[in-house]
Structure formats: C-alpha cells, structure tokens
C-alpha cells in the first residue's frame, strides 16, 4: 500500500497481477527520482480509492499499461 507521507519510495508491496481496467479510477506512473531510484506504478481503484502498487517488470502489468494507453488514445480527439 502506498504511503504518501514518505519522501522515499512509496510502495510497501507490489502485485504481478493486473487490475481490472473497469475498476480502475487512475493509473500513475512515477518515474525514478532522487527520492526513489525505481519506477513505481500506482493503481487507484474506484472502490474507496484503494491504491495498489504494480510491478513494472511484470509482463502482465506491461500489457495492462499498453491496454490503458491504447484506450486513452482512442478517447482523445
């Protein structure tokens, strides 16, 4: 679970399983920085705004990112 109050890396656990895009409110990709040396992907779910950290190295997660960006490009004019 993300801990927003820290200035270091955010995620406590990471999931290799993709979340259902329909239950997804928001997907944040936080690039590596001086505070955290790795990329972090945080999925915010529609239910209560629950946050889940996803494993950027997971093939399933990479596929999810592709699907979401494809969906976004369809929506944008």
């Amino acid at each position: 679970v993300p801990l927003s109050r820290t200035v270091r890396c955010t995620c406590i656990s990471i999931s290799n399983q993709p979340v259902n895009p329909r239950s997804l409110e928001k997907l944040e990709i936080i690039p590596a920085s001086q505070f955290c040396p790795r990329v972090e992907i945080i999925a915010t779910m529609k239910k209560k705004g629950e946050k889940r950290c996803l494993n950027p190295e997971s093939k399933a997660i990479k596929n999810l990112l592709k699907a979401v960006s494809k969906e976004r490009s369809k929506r944008s004019p």
Epitope: V1, C9, C11, I12, S13, K47
Partner: antibody, heavy 117, light 108 residues
Framework: QVQLVESGGGVVQPGRSLRLSCAAS????????MHWVRQAPGKGLEWVAV????????YYADSVKGRFTISRDNSKNTLYLQMNSLRAEDTAVYYC??????????WGRGTMVTVSS | SYVLTQPPSVSVAPGTTARITCGGN??????VHWYQQKPGQAPLLVIY???DRPSGIPLRFSGSNSGNTATLTISRVEAGDEADYYC???????????FGTGTKVTVL
C-alpha cells in the same frame, strides 16, 4: 505451501537485546511487504513494524520506535526484528505476517519473548 | 492516532447469527479487515476490504462497513467459530496499522 516460521524468542533481561527471524516459503518473498505483530499474554494484537518489499521503507509503532529495527534479506527469504533496550512491557508472542495491500493474509505461528529479571 | 472499538464479548447460540461490531470515526471511508484467532493459534484473515472472503473461508462469514461502524456477521454459527475476532485498518495519516480491541465470541 505458503509458510512463515519465526524463531529467536526466549527469556531476556530488561535492557538487553534479542533478534527475531522469520523464514518465508511458498510465495515470492521479494514482492511483498512484511510485518511484525505482537500479542502480550491475555491481551489483543498490536502492530509493531512493517518493511517494504525491497527494504526501502520501514515504519514502526510509537511504542518501539528507536529501539526496534526491522530488516530483510530477500536472497534468504528471511525477515528480521532486532530488539534493543528491551522492557517488561515487550513481553509477548511475536508474529511475522505477510502484507496483502494493508491486510495481513499469512501469519507465522509466533515466537515468545519474555523480558524478565 | 486512530482508535477501533469492539465489544469485549458476544454470546450466541449454535445455528443463529453473530454480529461483531467495530467502531471508528468515519470508518466507512476506510477498508476494514477481520481476523479470527483461536486459543494458542495465530490469527487468520477471514474478511478483507470490508466484505471480501479469502479462499477457504466459509460463506457464512460476511462483512459490511458504513458510517462509523464495520460489522462482521457469522451466520449459522458453529461451535468451531468460538474465538477472538479483531478488526483492523491502515491509518493513512500515520502510516500505522491499527487493530481493534478484540471480541471474544462464545457459542452457548
């Protein structure tokens, strides 16, 4: 199967130190945060500390902050709790538990720590 | 810090329904998890994210959460359900994990 096994408990005098270990098996240890939770005799559950999957983040209950240190070795699938300046009120069964996005889905059987002179 | 309050004990007859409450300020906005602990054993997760059941947990266990109260419901109670039950949340403001005071369920 998924398993957590704690060790390192025992009887120790106040002010002394003890190091607990938790050996994990049956899941991808390096993907999950890990917790220590304790239970004093006849009392309820008290969260002690958490460490993120890669060890970069650590958080502690106010009652142990500055005295206890949580750490992990992902190459050995092992979680640790270094307990310094032990007090009588630290007497408890100490459980390690696997994080499942802010729930504790897998627990070890616990190891007893008794602080007594 | 965030406080979760549970009744110390609940007594219930076999075959009936037990309801265990967990009170907290605006707890309905948070995700609540429930654990069962039998004497001499480690806690067991029985409900997570308010109402989801881990695999292996009977359908008799269910959860709800709104307002200032979360509830664990055990329907058709059996003798084997006799245990201590704890609610738990993650306190976003402190980054700490908080357990309720615990409820001892006695099957009459």
């Amino acid at each position: 199967q998924v398993q957590l096994v704690e060790s390192g408990g025992g009887v120790v005098q106040p002010g002394r130190s003890l190091r607990l270990s938790c050996a994990a098996s049956g899941f991808t240890f390096s993907s999950y945060g890990m917790h220590w939770v304790r239970q004093a005799p006849g009392k309820g559950l008290e969260w002690v500390a958490v460490i993120s999957y890669d060890g970069s983040n650590k958080y502690y209950a106010d009652s142990v902050k500055g005295r206890f240190t949580i750490s992990r070795d992902n190459s050995k699938n092992t979680l640790y709790l270094q307990m310094n300046s032990l007090r009588a009120e630290d007497t408890a069964v100490y459980y390690c538990a696997k994080d499942e996005f802010d729930a504790f889905d897998i627990w070890g059987r616990g190891t007893m720590v008794t602080v007594s002179s | 810090s965030y406080v979760l309050t549970q009744p110390p004990s609940v007594s219930v007859a076999p075959g009936t329904t037990a309801r265990i409450t967990c009170g907290g300020n605006n707890i309905g906005s948070r995700s609540v998890h429930w654990y069962q602990q039998k004497p001499g054993q480690a806690p067991l997760l029985v409900i997570y994210y308010d109402s989801d059941r881990p695999s292996g947990i009977p359908l008799r266990f269910s959860g709800s959460n709104s307002g200032n109260t979360a509830t664990l419901t055990i329907s058709r109670v059996e003798a084997g359900d006799e245990a201590d039950y704890y609610c738990q949340v993650w306190d976003t403001s402190s980054g700490h994990y908080v357990f309720g005071t615990g409820t001892k369920v006695t099957v009459l």
